[in-house]
């Protein structure tokens, strides 16, 4: 058993049929010695008396809010949550496996630049009675500070018969050095509670590996005289790190016909313009990627050829 926060405790249980459970001793936080009784949740049934209460925690029915009273007055309370371990593996029932970039990916994180600011998100099909608390650091043995805000419900989607809820959190490295080579990874830890079930999820990454630039901005077409060719121009996204001479992007320019089956013409360039043939009913799209490190491409910025 360990303390998650003041008055909230996590009981770690091996979860299998007829498991013996864990013996837990609760102590009433009071100088009083006698006349103390214990109850669980909203029940008025007295579970025991005295300054301590010993319980055998085997299942969710044994978890909950234990309260000690004297003469109708609440003295203190302890919330017991359960963390299940099945076949040596901690349960992951609360969050959904996003399966990208690999199986057992529960937390996904992205950064728009090298400023030390990043966003993580996760999915669940559980609609309410949820608690999320997020902590982060760079490195784990001698951790350097990363400040995370509160998680927020960022999207709701219908997936077949189920509703899926996306939660996200923004974090900022306290003393980020955008130009420095990273040697220690960022660690993100999410404590998740659903009703009386506790789970924790972690992700470890370098900022350079989760970089995904915003799409190029101000995408414009300029027809070239007496030609089917156009000059496409764009700018670095506002959110990208500066100076651009150091934090450079490379670009992919794509001409795509109306039909997805039509052949796509693609040009790669380090410049912020390119000359392409604009076919009727086609569209031109441009995306960006860090020039010197193969992290994710941005989403496409698009304009119609006409």
């Amino acid at each position: 058993i360990w303390e998650l926060k003041k008055d909230v405790y996590v009981v770690e249980l091996d979860w299998y049929p007829d498991a013996p459970g864990e013996m837990v001793v609760l102590t009433c936080d009071t100088p009083e010695e006698d006349g103390i009784t214990w109850t669980l949740d909203q029940s008025s049934e007295v579970l025991g008396s005295g300054k301590t209460l010993t319980i055998q925690v085997k299942e969710f029915g044994d978890a909950g809010q234990y309260t000690c009273h004297k003469g109708g007055e609440v003295l203190s309370h302890s919330l017991l949550l359960l963390h299940k371990k099945e076949d040596g593996i901690w349960s992951t029932d609360i969050l959904k496996d996003q399966k990208e970039p690999k199986n057992k990916t529960f937390l996904r994180c992205e950064a728009k630049n090298y400023s030390g600011r990043f966003t993580c998100w996760w999915l669940t099909t559980i609609s309410t009675d949820l608690t999320f608390s997020v902590k982060s650091s760079r490195g784990s043995s001698d951790p350097q500070g990363v400040t995370c805000g509160a998680a927020t419900l960022s999207a709701e989607r219908v997936r077949g018969d189920n509703k899926e809820y996306e939660y996200s959190v923004e974090c900022q490295e306290d003393s980020a050095c955008p130009a420095a080579e990273e040697s220690l990874p960022i660690e993100v830890m999410v404590d998740a509670v659903h009703k009386l079930k506790y789970e924790n999820y972690t992700s470890s990454f370098f900022i350079r590996d989760i970089i995904k630039p915003d799409p190029p901005k101000n995408l414009q077409l300029k027809p070239l005289k007496n030609s089917r060719q156009v000059e496409v121009s764009w700018e670095y996204p506002d959110t990208w790190s500066t100076p651009h001479s150091y934090f450079s992007l490379t670009f992919c320019v794509q001409v795509q016909g109306k039909s997805k089956r039509e052949k796509k013409d693609r040009v790669f360039t380090d410049k912020t313009s390119a000359t392409v043939i604009c076919r009727k009913n086609a569209s031109i799209s441009v995306r960006a990627q860090d020039r010197y490190y193969s992290s994710s491409w941005s989403e496409w910025a698009s304009v119609p050829c006409s």
Partner: nanobody, 119 residues
Framework: EVQLVESGGGLVQSGDPLRLSCAAS?????MAWFRQAPGEEREFVAV??????NYADSVKGRFTVSADNAKNTMYLQMNSLKPEDTAVYYC?????????????????WGQGTQVTVSS
């Protein structure tokens, strides 16, 4: 430490509405209402956290929780009040996301405001 102050309690007739307010001394991401009737355990009423809400079954459809983040204030609009809603109503707060119903999850507490519903 964030301070919470409840207001708006009072004596009303069965079926009447009442609006409670909870003012926080600083930004509080999650704010909740609990209530405690004489001789009863403190029970969850409603919570609002980053726009998400959760209600106790006993108040669903009658009570509405809302927040004005600019004023660091939460409200509980109580309609169709019943004698069994009589209790001291407490405001609770937390600095993280929760729609949980257990009061140990919450970090800060107000002193409470009395709501009495007469039949």
């Amino acid at each position: 430490e964030v301070q919470l102050v409840e207001s708006g309690g009072g004596l009303v007739q069965s079926g009447d509405p009442l609006r409670l307010s909870c003012a926080a001394s600083g930004p509080t991401y999650t704010m909740a209402w609990f209530r405690q009737a004489p001789g009863e355990e403190r029970e969850f009423v409603a919570v609002i956290s980053g726009g998400s809400t959760n209600y106790a079954d006993s108040v669903k459809g009658r009570f509405t929780v809302s927040a004005d983040n600019a004023k660091n204030t939460m409200y509980l609009q109580m309609n169709s009040l019943k004698p069994e809603d009589t209790a001291v109503y407490y405001c609770a707060g937390a600095g993280f996301y929760t729609t949980g119903t257990y009061y140990s999850l919450y970090d800060y507490w107000g002193q409470g405001t009395q709501v009495t519903v007469s039949s």
